[in-house]
């Protein structure tokens, strides 16, 4: 069963004193950070039990396995159902207090009952403050059951419930109709899921007989032991004030554990801590009587006087739990209560026993739970025991169970039941997840889902490239961190599967299913440089860069030019995508822009150095495009172009520029610059005869500005080839004076 | 489904006696109170007698006190009302009804939830 | 014994219409009343219990008020099937006593 108890304080004048505590032996219980161990919830369950809404209550942690409830303000803050959750997994537990108030008109006789399947349960509500009104019984909140107020017996309602079921199982309660819901008895019904000492799936096995007031679970057969007792069967009391399943804990306060009720995982429920009784738990045992509740009775034979936290203290010469054995009669010594071993082991398992006569190795035998005997194969005498070691078959899970060692001799005999848990080593259930991966190493989370039983004590990566042949790399990582496989190769595929050990000889599970993880291609390690750049318009630059001269193919996929605009903040990447191209034009860029400029190889996603960055500037935009532009054919050679200047200069215009071209001709075009900015005409020369030509025109300012409309000529017709246009400008106004 | 089936009703002389019976199904018969209920031709209902559910406690109307019994047989399922000493005025169409309790803002209230068709004496 | 008391006796209304029935108690009963529809040769049917607690599968146009001495049961839009008799019960004590019965017509 999951160590996990729930401490409530009762000590009820004050609410705002009273707490909810609750506990985990667990290990890594709490932490709740990781995948191993899910965090301790402690609540108050208003589904069955409702009372008037007040202020939040308190959630306090201590540490990973502590949990506190405070913030109580008033008593009916305190009536109702609490439970706490603990454990992982499969043996995620819930433990469940129900509080009555002490005021209520009807009280508990008993708070817990556990029975078991097929009895007949008794609960008993007894009458506080008396009303003379039918009482109604109810099963986790809806209506079960009637009574008369003159059906209480002996100042008591009772309700039975014969042949209960585990559907039985929940909070009952007994209200008088009238009354306040908190006015209620509260009770706690669990019911077995077997019958009186029985076990297991069709209830076949057979409970290991629980001392002390131990409740035998039904699903696994162990004992949960009373606070206060401990080992496979209760046997062992703890020191007084503590409790556990190791008695590791300590009740808190300088009055130990007066005052406060326990509550342990079904099917025990609720009680006082041992030596304690009483609704509040502040009572001592009666003379004669130990134990949780001080249910148990001492009954001490032979001199031994009754303690009442652990029952009988045998005078020397005397054991037993009445004092009732005599030291002369063998007894088995010091055997571990529970032992753990993986599957298809085979362990040694040791027994040592003492007495008069003295334990020889035929006299201590070994039983299974299926009966089988094994007799030991060797034993180690001493002066003061024998002990007897044991080679068991490879185990198989029906091993799991009680195991007996028992030594007789003519003296009389002792045995000692041990529980034998048999584990399932790990098997992870899922291929590891791949979180980064380079060139060379691959980063891996190894924490999948497994079955099989935990806790899991190394975690194994195995790995290797696909499709080879070659041995499996192992490496052994801690199973909270992730791994980083390095030294691999560039652009390989790498079968990688998980194994998981659980603690002990034989704990290694099969490995895991695998999964393919790719490393990166390799890292472009040349370097470019800048050759140089110029400038194409405004808005437009050309680039040219080299590479170094290296032996060998070259690494790369293509150049990643990077364009950074500091003023703006904006960052412009152009992709080419060719290893052999030395140039780039770079077009729609901003106009009067300072930008830095780098180029770095790239192959596949990885970039490789980048170049020494330039610095370049843009010219701004220039000025509108020129007005009312027109061509007229002055002869076979020549065209005059006249124009209007652009309208809302930002400045004083430097030239402007012409475009000359054949009309449907293929060739480029020609630019003829007219240096004088303050003409509007000029004459191009030069021309070709019956030529359709077609101009366009544009100012300068810093820069090159927008092209005017595009205008179309002929030379006119019968002169001869001519050299190439050329130009002659004058002022529009001296042209026409002319 | 829960159903209450009465049956035992007919025609009867002053004096004379009827015994009623009560045939319940779908719910657990033993945990519940039962009543029955009457209804003289064109009046209103008048509650007559109510049992509880361990077949102990009993409680009449005055003016059926000493002449009507209720009973309860839990191992049938079945509600019964013993009528001696009949008079003209107990003419009427009894009903049993079945007692629940149902939770409301914190407290229980009871009620007749489920009733039979009625059977005329 | 607790007696109760149902007003009006009978009353004529159309469909559509809203209706209120009102039931009063000799002595405090708190909320301890129940509402219930009959119809001709038909058993009583539970409408409303604790006073204003709609029993499950009755329409929500049925609704109850009151504490006390004095309880009102409403239907605020009549229906065709809703033209019967409507009795107040009281749970408070034993004997469980009824009012004398409601009976809504048609106009």
């Known amino acids: 069963a999951v160590d996990l108890t729930l401490l409530a304080n009762l000590r009820l004048t004050d609410p705002q004193r009273f707490f909810l505590t609750c506990v985990s032996g667990e290990a890594g219980a709490g932490r709740g950070s990781d995948a191993w161990g899910p965090p301790l919830l402690l609540e108050k369950d208003d589904r069955i039990v409702r009372t008037p809404p007040g202020p939040p209550l308190r959630l306090a942690r201590n540490g990973s396995h502590q949990v506190t409830l405070r913030g109580f303000s008033k008593p009916s803050d305190l009536v109702g159902v609490f439970s706490c959750v603990g454990g992982a997994g499969a043996r995620r537990t819930r433990v469940i207090y129900v509080h009555n108030s002490p005021g209520a008109h009807l009280l508990p006789d008993k708070v817990t009952h556990t029975v078991n399947k097929g009895d007949t349960a008794v609960l008993s509500a007894r009458v506080h403050k008396e009303k003379q009104t039918d009482v109604i019984w109810k099963s986790n909140g809806s209506y079960f059951y009637t009574l008369d107020w003159h059906e209480a017996q002996d100042g008591r309602f009772l309700l039975q419930l014969p042949n209960v079921q585990p559907p039985s199982s929940g909070i009952y309660s007994a209200t008088y109709l009238e009354a306040s819901p908190l006015g209620s008895a509260f009770f706690r019904l669990i019911v077995r899921g077997c019958g009186a000492g029985r076990w297991g799936p069709g209830c076949t096995k057979e409970c290991p007989g629980c001392l002390h007031g131990g409740v035998c679970h039904d699903h696994d057969g162990e004992c949960v032991c009373p606070p206060g007792f401990t080992g496979t069967r209760c046997e062992q009391a703890c020191r007084e004030g503590r409790f556990g399943q190791s008695c590791q804990e300590q009740c808190p306060g300088i009055s130990g554990c007066r005052g406060l009720t326990f509550c342990l995982p079904d099917p025990y429920g609720c009680s006082c801590g041992s030596g304690w009784r009483g609704s509040q738990c502040q009572e001592a045992c009666a003379p004669g009587h130990f134990g949780a509740d001080c249910r148990l009775q001492c009954q001490c034979q032979n001199g031994g006087t009754c303690d009442r936290f652990s029952g009988c203290v045998c005078p020397s010469g005397w054991h037993g739990v009445h004092c009732e054995k005599s030291d002369r009669i063998p007894q088995i010594l010091n055997m571990a209560s529970e032992l753990e071993f993986n599957l298809e082991t085979m362990p040694r398992i040791n027994c040592a026993a003492a007495g008069n006569p003295f334990p020889v190795r035929g006299s201590i035998e070994l039983r299974k739970p299926d009966g089988t005997v094994l007799l030991s194969t060797k034993a180690i005498v001493e002066p003061e025991k024998t002990t007897a070691e044991f080679e068991v078959p490879r185990l198989v899970l029906a091993d799991s169970g009680f195991w007996e060692c028992r030594v007789s001799t003519s003296g009389g005999q002792d045995s000692r039941r041990f529980k034998v848990n048999v584990k399932v080593p790990p098997v992870p259930l899922a291929a590891p997840r791949l979180l980064t991966k380079q060139s060379r190493q691959l980063v891996v989370s190894p924490l999948v889902s497994f079955s099989g039983d935990g806790p899991i004590s190394t975690v194994r990566l195995h790995y290797r490239p696909q499709d080879s042949t070659m041995d499996w790399s192992t490496i052994v990582v801690d199973p909270s961190e992730n791994v980083t496989l390095m030294n691999l190769r560039p652009k390989t595929g790498y079968s990688v599967r998980v194994q998981l050990s659980r603690p002990g000889e034989g704990g290694e599970g099969a490995w895991g299913p695998p999964t393919l993880m790719t490393t990166d291609c390799p890292e472009p390690l040349l370097q470019p440089w800048l050759e140089g750049w110029h400038v194409e318009g405004t808005d437009r630059l050309r680039v040219s860069w080299s590479l170094p001269l290296v032996p060998g193919p070259l690494v790369g996929d293509g150049f990643l030019l990077r364009l950074w605009d500091g003023t703006r903040g904006q960052e412009r990447r152009e992709n080419v995508s060719s290893p052999q191209a030395r140039t780039a034009l770079l077009t729609g860029l901003t106009p009067g822009t300072h930008y830095q400029l780098d180029v770095q190889l790239y192959h596949c996603t990885l970039l490789g150095p980048a170049s020494p960055p330039a610095h370049v500037l843009l010219p701004p935009s220039g000025p509108p495009a020129p007005r009312h532009l027109h061509a007229q054919a002055l002869s076979d050679s020549e065209i005059q172009l006249t124009w209007k200047h652009p309208e809302a200069l930002p400045g004083p215009i430097s030239k402007y520029v012409v475009e000359v071209q054949v009309a449907g001709g293929a060739g480029d075009p020609l630019w003829i610059d007219v240096d004088r900015p303050e003409e509007t005409s000029t004459i191009i020369r030069g021309l070709n005869a019956s030529t359709r030509y077609l101009f366009r025109m544009r100012a300068s300012i810093q820069g090159l500005g927008d092209w005017s409309n595009t205008v179309e000529e002929s030379t006119l017709g019968n002169g001869l080839q001519a050299e190439g246009p050329v130009q002659e400008s004058r002022a529009a106004e001296e042209g026409l004076d002319q | 489904e829960v159903q209450l089936l009465e049956s035992g009703g007919g025609l009867v002389q002053p004096g004379g006696s009827l015994r009623l019976s009560c045939a319940a199904s779908?719910?657990?018969?033993?945990?519940?109170?039962m009543f029955w209920v009457r209804q003289a031709p064109g009046k209103g209902l008048e509650w007559v007698s109510v049992?509880?559910?361990?077949?102990?406690?009993?409680m009449y109307a005055d003016s059926v006190k000493g002449r009507f019994t209720i009973s309860r047989d839990n191992s049938k399922n079945t509600l019964y009302l013993q009528m001696n000493s009949l008079r003209a005025e107990d003419t009427a169409v009894y009903y049993c009804?079945?007692?629940?309790?149902?939770?409301?803002?914190?407290?229980?209230?009871?009620?007749?939830?489920?009733w039979g068709q009625g059977t005329l004496v | 014994d607790i007696q109760m008391t149902q007003s009006p006796s009978s009353l004529s209304a159309s469909v559509g219409d809203r209706v209120t029935i009102t039931c009063r108690a000799s002595?405090?009963?708190?909320?301890?009343l129940n509402w219930y529809q009959q119809k001709p040769g038909k058993a009583p049917k539970l409408l409303i219990y604790?006073?204003?607690s709609l029993q499950s599968g009755v329409p929500s146009r049925f609704s109850g008020s009151g504490s006390g001495t004095d309880f009102t049961l409403t239907i605020s839009s009549l229906q065709p099937e809703d033209f019967a008799t409507y009795y107040c019960?009281?749970?408070?004590?034993?004997?469980?006593?009824f009012g004398q019965g409601t009976k809504v017509e048609i106009k």
């Open positions: 009804a079945r007692g629940m309790v149902r939770g409301y803002s914190g407290y229980d209230y009871p009620f007749l939830d489920y």
């Open positions: 779908g719910f657990t018969f033993s945990r519940y109170k």
């Open positions: 049992i509880y559910p361990s077949g102990g406690p009993t």
């Open positions: 002595q405090t009963i708190s909320s301890y």
């Open positions: 019960q009281q749970s408070y004590s034993t004997p469980r006593t």
């Open positions: 604790a006073a204003s």
